[in-house]
């Protein structure tokens, strides 16, 4: 069998459009594909952040590809040409790789970058990120946050910083239209008169960092002599009922503690006639049907039912938060 040598694509490069980690990989067709004019060649593209164990592999007929990367690390990529099986008349094909790398030249020592970056998407409505200044940075250091997601023309800077001692330590984001279920990119860079400050890059999806409001309107209903139904309502806001999981804490007569996780806004509790007091609190979290992760809400106000006979439905609402 003869062997065909096929060149790799030309001008293979990684281009940074300024989207804080969303990069373009692009190339041109290989030289001298004259023998294969009738064939639709494909390209096998492999890429990863440097230090990652696995390559991501794409096969495409296009001359470009886009994906997100962690710009705190370098990126390596390689590409070669593939010929369709039917094109080669049984000949073996040797296809060499073109390789390229990309990284942002780091400024400043790692300790100068922001510490303990924490972002929460409150009630699927308000994004707030906070951080601590880098270790050993002077008071003249200030940090700036930039963000981008698909749908924005360019990266935007935070316009509502949270400050402490004149330094930016957080950002309150504006309304973010059509921003969930896609990668959300953040860069926090800094400036100082005295020394360069290392930039930090973060990527997450907003639906995975939601902290809902606590459930409301907690009530009791006697179902039978030995069953009480606990009910509550979803909090106000954009999160639909199908997206919630709940955790309940129930105390009977200040001793028995029952905890349960449920998917609906009700829980049926077995009780005895001796029960004198019943209190419960509920908290909510976005479930696996709507996100890959989430943050538990605060506990609801405590709702208690007291009296000689629970069936009299004597309700006492305690307006302090349970911790």
């Amino acid at each position: 069998d003869t062997e065909i040598k096929v060149n790799p694509p030309q001008d293979f490069e990684i281009v940074d459009p300024g989207y804080l980690g969303y990069l373009y990989l692009q190339w041109q067709p290989p030289l001298s594909l004259d023998h294969f004019k009738e064939c639709t060649v494909e390209y096998e593209l492999k890429y990863r952040n440097i230090g990652s164990e696995t390559w991501k592999t794409i096969i495409t007929k296009n001359l470009h590809y886009k994906d997100g990367f962690d710009l705190n690390k370098g990126i390596e990529a390689k590409i070669h040409t593939l010929l369709p099986w039917q094109c080669t008349n049984g000949s073996e094909v040797q296809s060499s790789w073109a390789e390229t790398t990309y990284w942002i030249s780091p400024q400043g020592i790692p300790e100068t970058k922001v510490q303990d970056m924490d972002c929460v998407y409150y009630n699927w409505q308000y994004l707030l990120c906070s951080w601590k200044p880098g270790i050993g940075v002077l008071l003249d250091t200030n940090y700036n946050l930039f963000y981008w997601y698909e749908g924005l023309d360019h990266a935007l800077q935070c316009v509502d910083y949270i400050k402490a001692d004149g330094q930016n330590i957080g950002c309150r984001f504006p309304y973010l239209e059509a921003s969930d279920y896609k990668d959300f990119y953040i860069c926090v860079n800094g400036s100082s008169e005295n020394k360069p400050i290392r930039s930090s890059y973060f990527t997450f999806q907003l639906q995975n960092i939601v902290k809902p409001l606590p459930p409301v309107y907690l009530t009791f209903t006697r179902e039978s002599s030995c069953e009480i139904k606990l009910k509550w309502s979803i909090p106000l806001g954009p999160i639909p009922a199908r997206c919630f999981d709940y955790e309940i804490e129930i105390r009977e007569d200040d001793t028995t503690l029952v905890t349960a996780t449920v998917e609906n806004e009700t829980y049926t509790l077995k009780t005895t006639n001796e029960t004198r007091q019943l209190c419960f609190v509920v908290r909510s979290k976005v479930n696996i049907y709507c996100s890959d992760d989430g943050i538990w809400s605060e506990w609801s106000d405590k709702q208690c039912w007291e009296g000689e006979d629970l069936s009299k439905k004597t309700l006492l609402r305690h307006h302090h938060h349970h911790h």
Epitope: I4, I59, T81, L82, E92, V93, Q94
Partner: nanobody
Framework: QVQLQESGGGSVQPGGSLRLSCAAS????????MEWFRQGPGEQRELVAH???????EYADFVKGRFTISRANAKNTLYLQMNGLKPEDTALYYC?????????WGQGTQVTVSS
């Protein structure tokens, strides 16, 4: 005629399982690298899993621990066991046979994960 034929796709609820098969004809697959790719709407084909001639396997990060690739050389067939399926696994799944710089594709089988 050399060809690959996938089967086993279908519709399943989140958390469900499917087993895809890829039968080769006109070629003996025992000495070839075999792979599963998938292609979502408007996306490029991305590698899901890869198996060498001596059955060493590699998986994309997004399926590790959920999918298992295997091969039965005597039956000239490649398999993909898919457990813990998620809505984002919805795609057309293709098997591919690799030999150097040439590639043979199957026609694909549709997997839909929806509640």
């Amino acid at each position: 005629q050399v060809q690959l034929q996938e089967s086993g796709g279908g519709s399943v609820q989140p958390g469900g399982s499917l087993r895809l098969s890829c039968a080769a004809s006109g070629i003996n697959i025992s000495s070839d690298v075999m792979e599963w790719f998938r292609q979502g709407p408007g996306e490029q084909r991305e590698l899901v899993a890869h198996i060498t001639t001596n059955s060493r396997t590699e998986y994309a990060d997004f399926v590790k621990g959920r999918f298992t690739i295997s091969r039965a050389n005597a039956k000239n067939t490649l398999y993909l066991q898919m457990n813990g399926l998620k809505p984002e696994d919805t795609a057309l799944y293709y098997c591919a046979l690799r030999r150097g710089g040439r590639i043979l594709w199957g026609q694909g089988t549709q997997v839909t994960v929806s509640s």
